[in-house]
């Protein structure tokens, strides 16, 4: 058993049929010595008396808010949560496996630039009685500070018969130099509590590996005389690291109709303009990627050919 | 140590081309190592990230773009010099700051070159003959060092009398390649910045 936060404790249980469970001793936070009784949750049934209460925790029925009282007055609470371990593996029931970029990916993180700011998100099908808390650091043995905000519900989607909820959090490394060469990864730890179930999820990454620029901005077309060709120009996204001559991007320019199966024109360039062939009912799209370290491409920025 | 000598070059900033070739060569070699050594811990997640130039050179700080010298977090390790122009540029006004940056890059290359050559000598003794360093990568390191145009004491190649542990050597190769790729990215950014200056 360990303390998650004040008056909230996590009991780690090996989860299998007829498991013996874990013996837990609760102590009432009071100077009083006599006349103390214990109850669980909203029940008025007295579980025991005295300053300490010893319980055998085996299942979720044994978890919950234990309260010690004296003469009708509440003295203190201890909330017990369960963390299940099945076949040596901690449970991951609360969050959905996103399977990208690999199996068992519960947390996904992205950064728009090298400033040390990044966003992580996760998915769940659970809609109520759910709380998250996020901690982060650079390195684990001698951790350097990363400050994370509160996790918020950022999107809801319908997936077949189920509703899916996306939560996200923004974090900022306390002292980040955009030009630095990372040797210690960022560690992100998410504590998830659903009712009386506790789970924790972690992700470890270098900012350089989670870079995904915003789409290029200000796409403009200029038809070329006596030609099917069009000159398309754009600018670096505002959120990208500066100076741009140091943090350079490379671009992919594509002309395609509405269907992905349709024919297309595609060209890669390090410049902020390119010449392509425009077709009726097609769109010109441009996306960006770090020129020197190939992490993710940005989403497409598009304008219609016409 | 001699400061870099600026040789007039009417064409493109010459080091940019070499640094692009360097990054490409290192990336290819790293990819080859990851494929060939698939049963060794050779991915970014599996290896320890070591920097053989740590406390010996200060490329990131010495080559920091002017715009980032206002960022306190970029200045925490030492008095930072910033880059303005340099020997690879066709200019005779090579600043001291610039020389420091390019000299630091040169020292990085020299250190990695020695490490890679030593390692290759060991790998050539491996009866499995599983992996060797790409000669193209070694040649590209050499070309960039020549383009940087420094005179520097030659570092003797390390020789080891004991029987090499090939497993450890291959893991060290992965560690070196990952670190060198990151440094090659920095070098490319620096050269691109200089080219635009």
């Amino acid at each position: 058993i360990w303390e998650l936060k004040k008056d909230v404790y996590v009991v780690e249980l090996d989860w299998y049929p007829d498991a013996p469970g874990e013996m837990v001793v609760l102590t009432c936070d009071t100077p009083e010595e006599d006349g103390i009784t214990w109850t669980l949750d909203q029940s008025s049934e007295v579980l025991g008396s005295g300053k300490t209460l010893t319980i055998q925790v085996k299942e979720f029925g044994d978890a919950g808010q234990y309260t010690c009282h004296k003469g009708g007055e509440v003295l203190s609470h201890s909330l017990l949560l369960l963390h299940k371990k099945e076949d040596g593996i901690w449970s991951t029931d609360i969050l959905k496996d996103q399977k990208e970029p690999k199996n068992k990916t519960f947390l996904r993180c992205e950064a728009k630039n090298y400033s040390g700011r990044f966003t992580c998100w996760w998915l769940t099908t659970i809609s109520t009685d759910l709380t998250f808390s996020v901690k982060s650091s650079r390195g684990s043995s001698d951790p350097q500070g990363v400050t994370c905000g509160a996790a918020t519900l950022s999107a809801e989607r319908v997936r077949g018969d189920n509703k899916e909820y996306e939560y996200s959090v923004e974090c900022q490394e306390d002292s980040a130099c955009p030009a630095a060469e990372e040797s210690l990864p960022i560690e992100v730890m998410v504590d998830a509590v659903h009712k009386l179930k506790y789970e924790n999820y972690t992700s470890s990454f270098f900012i350089r590996d989670i870079i995904k620029p915003d789409p290029p901005k200000n796409l403009q077309l200029k038809p070329l005389k006596n030609s099917r060709q069009v000159e398309v120009s754009w600018e670096y996204p505002d959120t990208w690291s500066t100076p741009h001559s140091y943090f350079s991007l490379t671009f992919c320019v594509q002309v395609q109709g509405k269907s992905k199966r349709e024919k297309k024109d595609r060209v890669f360039t390090d410049k902020t303009s390119a010449t392509v062939i425009c077709r009726k009912n097609a769109s010109i799209s441009v996306r960006a990627q770090d020129r020197y370290y190939s992490s993710s491409w940005s989403e497409w920025a598009s304008v219609p050919c016409s | 140590r001699n400061l870099p000598v600026a040789t007039p070059d009417p064409g493109m900033f010459p080091c940019l081309h070499h640094s692009q070739n360097l990054l490409r060569a290192v990336s290819n070699m790293l990819q080859k190592a990851r494929q060939t050594l698939e049963f060794y811990p050779c991915t970014s997640e599996e290896i320890d990230h070591e920097d053989i130039t740590k406390d010996k050179t200060s490329t990131v700080e010495a080559c920091l773009p002017l715009e980032l010298t206002k960022n306190e977090s970029c200045l925490n390790s030492r008095e930072t010099s910033f880059i303005t122009n340099g020997s690879c540029l066709a200019s005779r006004k090579t600043s001291f700051m610039m020389a420091l940056c390019l000299s630091s890059i040169y020292e990085d290359l020299k250190m990695y070159q020695v490490e890679f050559k030593t390692m290759n000598a060991k790998l050539l003794m491996d009866p499995k003959r599983q992996i060797f360093l790409d000669q193209n990568m070694l040649a590209v390191i050499d070309e960039l060092m020549q383009a940087l145009n420094f005179n520097s004491e030659t570092v003797p190649q390390k020789s080891s009398l004991e029987e090499p542990d090939f497993y450890k050597t291959k893991i060290k190769l992965c560690i070196l390649l990952h670190a060198f790729r990151i440094r090659a990215v920095t070098i490319d950014r620096v050269m691109s910045y200089l080219n635009a200056s």
Epitope: T250, K264, D265, R266, V267, F268, D270, I277 | -
Partner: antibody, heavy 118, light 107 residues
């Protein structure tokens, strides 16, 4: 399976014209760009131009501009390349090639030898 | 027009040995470069597109690398069926242009 079948070899006199055909099978004809290139005996490849069979849009290499015409007939899934004012240096194998991507070629015809000789 | 220069023009190789063909563009073309193989009396066949992207059905011993002006086609271990002429082609701008070709011959 996508295939491009070209018409047979031709022998032409200098100053005349030649029209080579390229019939496509497998896949929808208008879903692909169609290109023509040529290869003189023992020489490299030379791109001549492309057509979008969907709308008849064409683009030609400046070297052939005014001498080459590329057309397409959607009803027969056939593209044509006509080269006029032939000279001996036009002796070459002419290839059609297609792709959903405009700028490179993933399926090629077998080639048509055009010999220009007096 | 962008001029593509291949080297060497002839490459004698022992079967089973690796081979590398270089292609240089007269100006920067990013990764807009493609490689073809041509055997005598046959049409060219696409091997690699956009400098390093492999084509399904093409053996994995063929790989491409490069960007900007310098590109390489590598055959890790030459098989008898690989003796042919190889062409690079740029798609950065029209007119599309090819290298002169590199003939890989048996040593």
């Amino acid at each position: 399976q996508v295939q491009l079948v070209q018409s047979g070899a031709e022998v032409k006199k200098p100053g005349s014209s030649v029209k080579v055909s390229c019939k496509a099978s497998g896949g929808t004809f208008s879903d692909y760009y169609l290109h023509w290139q040529r290869q003189a005996p023992g020489q490299g490849l030379e791109w001549m131009g492309w057509i979008d069979p969907e709308n008849g849009d064409t683009e030609y290499a400046p070297k052939f501009q005014g001498r080459v015409t590329i057309t397409a007939d959607e009803s027969t899934s056939t593209a044509y390349m006509e080269l006029s004012s032939l000279r001996s240096e036009d002796t070459a194998v002419y290839y059609c090639a297609r792709n959903k991507e405009l700028r490179y070629f993933d399926v090629w015809g077998q080639g048509t030898l055009v010999t220009v000789s007096s | 027009d962008i001029v593509m220069t291949q080297s060497p023009l002839s490459l004698p190789v022992t079967p089973g040995e690796p081979a590398s063909i270089s292609c240089r563009a007269s100006q920067s073309i990013s990764i807009n470069l493609h490689w073809y193989q041509q055997k005598p009396g046959q049409a060219p066949r696409l091997l690699i597109y956009f400098a390093s992207q492999s084509i399904s059905g093409v053996p994995s011993r063929f790989s491409g690398s490069g960007s900007g002006t310098d590109f390489t086609l590598t055959i890790s271990s030459l098989q008898p069926e690989d003796f042919a002429t190889y062409y690079c082609q740029q798609s950065n701008s029209f007119p599309l242009t090819f290298g002169q070709g590199t003939k890989v011959e048996i040593k």
